[in-house]
Interface confidence: medium
Amino acid sequence: APISSHCRLDKSNFQQPYITNRTFMLAKEASLADNNTDVRLIGEKLFHGVSMSERCYLMKQVLNFTLEEVLFPQSDRFQPYMQEVVPFLARLSNRLSTCHIEGDDLHIQRNVQKLKDTVKKLGESGEIKAIGELDLLFMSLRNACI
């Protein structure tokens, strides 16, 4: 089971209208540039076999990957939204840095790895797709971590 007290975010993180709006605007701009509508990164498959109490830990893994491998390298795109959203998401990642799971997390890593592989396989269009799903990432973090 996760160390659940550490796998939490205060709901105030998701109640800031300005940065919430900027996150959704960024996702919208990127999704307009995403021409691959057949693939969904954050969906039912991501959560398959993962209990509700483990979902925040899973979303932490997805958030860290998105920051490190997608948002930082793509940070020149989709301005002015990216400039404000990336530090906001980095702060959320930082607040989840003590969120761990005691015991086997192989089932979670397997699901996250599939998402990573999909992004890598699609190349730059995969990264654009990941940015286009930041609204889903935001909502999934909120639902899983508060």
Partner: antibody
Framework: EVQLLESGGGLVQPGGSLRLSCAAS????????MSWVRQAPGKGLEWVST????????YHADSVKGRLTISRDNSKNTLYLEMNSLRVEDTAVYYC?????????????????WGQGTLVTVSS | EIVMTQSPAILSVSPGERATLSCRAS??????LAWFQQKPGQAPRLLIY???KRATGTPARFSGSGSGTDFTLTISSLEPEDFAVYFC??????????FGQGTKLEIK
């Protein structure tokens, strides 16, 4: 050889201005974010500013916001720091550093290459 | 702002001996911690990144460990060229990088 070379430092009065430059060579400058870090005499290191690879986004420490501005010219492989309304506490050696970016093999995420620094002295 | 605190401020060790430098963060920085070495009149040089990974050119005698808030840089057997100032740095609170105040490693 990967190299960063700062210039433009010197003695300036409080309230004055300076423009620092950092010439990059030996790597694909346009694919990396770049940062300025400063070090007051005998003190520790302080992050000043970061700019993304093509200049689309800039970030500044609160202590310099509105006074120091980072920019870059990728056609000249050069990073800049425009310094206005300088204060005595801005006296420091200013280093430019290669920040995160993407290579064929990985995403580089640390300040792995630094210039030799240029000294800015603010004094009346 | 995440505050990084290094200890001790000055560490006196003899060549050939082991040196252990500590760095503590005011809140968790996960494993996003780097160590830099700085010699007088020179720029800092990246030694360790992501807590324990050696940067290109860093000798094997340097190792990093820790996670969360407490980190350690260990030099297994000190060489004369290792005497310098060492800084830790977090990049967890991006882009607000913060550094420790430094530990001066001097010859005993």
């Amino acid at each position: 050889e990967v190299q960063l070379l700062e210039s433009g430092g010197g003695l300036v009065q409080p309230g004055g201005s300076l423009r620092l430059s950092c010439a990059a060579s030996g790597f694909t400058f346009s694919t990396y974010a770049m940062s300025w870090v400063r070090q007051a005499p005998g003190k520790g290191l302080e992050w000043v500013s970061t700019i993304t690879s093509s200049g689309g986004a800039t970030y500044h420490a609160d202590s310099v916001k509105g006074r120091l501005t980072i920019s870059r010219d990728n056609s000249k492989n050069t990073l800049y720091l425009e310094m206005n309304s300088l204060r005595v506490e801005d006296t420091a050696v200013y280093y430019c550093a290669k920040d995160w970016g993407r290579t064929v093999y990985a995403v580089i995420k640390d300040l792995d290459i630094w210039g030799q620094g240029t000294l800015v002295t603010v004094s009346s | 702002e995440i505050v990084m605190t290094q200890s001790p401020a000055i560490l006196s060790v003899s060549p050939g001996e082991r040196a252990t430098l500590s760095c503590r963060a005011s809140q968790s920085v996960s494993n996003y911690l780097a160590w830099f070495q700085q010699k007088p009149g020179q720029a800092p040089r990246l030694l360790i990144y992501d807590t324990s990974k050696r940067a290109t050119g860093t000798p094997a005698r340097f190792s990093g460990s820790g996670s969360g808030t407490d980190f350690t840089l260990t030099i297994s057997s000190l060489e004369p060229e290792d005497f310098a100032v060492y800084f830790c740095q977090q990049r967890s609170d991006w882009p607000q990088y913060t550094f420790g105040q430094g530990t001066k490693l001097e010859i005993k």
